[in-house]
């Protein structure tokens, strides 16, 4: 079974800069999985942000504009990355990755 690790416990960024979060997949080939990213803002329910499927297809939360969250997958390091562009106060949250095994 696949296992996920998010090596960064926290990330502090200046407003308008870029934050890059990592999710390391082990126990399964990342190319045979779909990786999902969620966020939990303080006092709010967890929210789906974006996913990247085994074939590279990206789906995003329809209410968030393109260009805000960028998801990628690096097979060589078995890592999925979530890049948050133009960091602002509403991005303060806990971010989670999740795995769907195909």
């Amino acid at each position: 079974a696949g296992h996920l690790e998010q090596p960064q416990i926290s990330s502090t960024k200046t407003l308008s800069k870029t934050a890059r979060l990592e999710c390391v997949v082990s126990g399964i080939t990342i190319s045979a999985t779909s990786v999902y990213w969620y966020r939990e803002r303080p006092g709010e329910v967890i929210q789906f942000l974006v996913s990247i499927s085994y074939d590279g297809t990206v789906r995003k939360e329809s209410g968030i504009p393109s260009g805000k969250f960028e998801v990628d997958r690096i097979p060589e390091t078995s890592t999925s990355t979530l890049t948050i562009h133009n960091v602002e106060k509403q991005d303060i949250a806990t971010y989670y990755c999740a795995l769907w095994e195909v």
Epitope: I52, G56, T57, V58, R59, K60, S62, G63, I64, P65, S66, G67, K68, E70, V71, D72, T83, H85, N86, Q90
Partner: antibody, heavy 118, light 108 residues
Framework: EVQLVQSGGDLVKSGGSLRLSCAAS????????MYWVRQAPGKGLEWVSS????????FYADSVKGRFTISRDNAMTSLYLQMNRLGAEDSAVYYC???????????WGQGTLVTVSS | EIVLTQSPGTLSLSPGERATLSCRAS???????LAWFQQKPGQAPRLLIF???SRATGIPDRFSGSGSGTDFTLTISRLEPEDFAVYHC?????????FGGGTKVDIK
């Protein structure tokens, strides 16, 4: 059927203001991000602004920042672009657009022409 | 800002021929975030390809996309009369979203 119907384009003097509207139907407007894209005569496409479903996220191209304001009314299922301090470089056909389920800008309005005269 | 440069500016071909359009980025673009649009005179653009190579709904299979990093290509395998138009590439991974300048495919 997704429909985006635009209005508000006009001839305006340099330094003037204009408000564009985009009336949406055929989908749950309050669930989707919306965009404005423009095209100057004989030129390429230029992204102008984006707004999230609940107006949480708003982005502008540097060329319009501080002059243009994007907004939406989810109850009226409408998108707006308030354009102030217009200059000749803002003359273009303005399109509103919505993403598809997978791809960007899958649905477009018919376009509305803004002409700025000196 | 990612600058997209399309070439050639104009491509003159005959129906039935193969068209190859290029889109070059000033910095690396994820393959998940590169799209192509077709635009005919007086009309709004139409999404053809997203995620570098996935065809949008209703797009015929003579249209295909490929590439990675900074170099992307749209190929029309056999030009039909209705394919003569302007084609735009777009990167939508990071704000500001940026379009290329367009390539016009016209009849030789």
């Amino acid at each position: 059927e997704v429909q985006l119907v635009q209005s508000g384009g006009d001839l305006v003097k340099s330094g003037g203001s204009l408000r564009l509207s985009c009336a949406a139907s055929g989908f749950t407007f309050s669930s989707y991000s919306m965009y404005w894209v423009r095209q100057a005569p004989g030129k390429g496409l230029e992204w102008v602004s984006s707004i999230g479903s609940s107006s949480t996220y708003i982005f502008y191209a540097d060329s319009v920042k501080g002059r243009f304001t994007i907004s939406r009314d989810n109850a009226m299922t409408s998108l707006y672009l308030q354009m102030n301090r217009l200059g000749a470089e803002d003359s273009a056909v303005y399109y509103c657009a919505r993403d598809g389920e997978l791809g960007p800008f899958e649905y477009w309005g018919q376009g509305t022409l803004v002409t700025v005269s000196s | 800002e990612i600058v997209l440069t399309q070439s050639p500016g104009t491509l003159s071909l005959s129906p039935g021929e193969r068209a190859t359009l290029s889109c070059r980025a000033s910095q690396s673009v994820s393959t998940s975030y590169l799209a192509w649009f077709q635009q005919k005179p007086g009309q709004a653009p139409r999404l053809l390809i997203f995620g570098t190579s996935s065809r949008a709904t209703g797009i015929p299979d003579r249209f295909s996309g490929s590439g990675s990093g900074t170099d992307f290509t749209l190929t029309i395998s056999r030009l039909e009369p209705e394919d003569f138009a302007v084609y735009h590439c777009l990167q939508y991974g990071r704000s500001p979203l940026t379009f290329g300048g367009g390539t016009k495919v016209d009849i030789k």
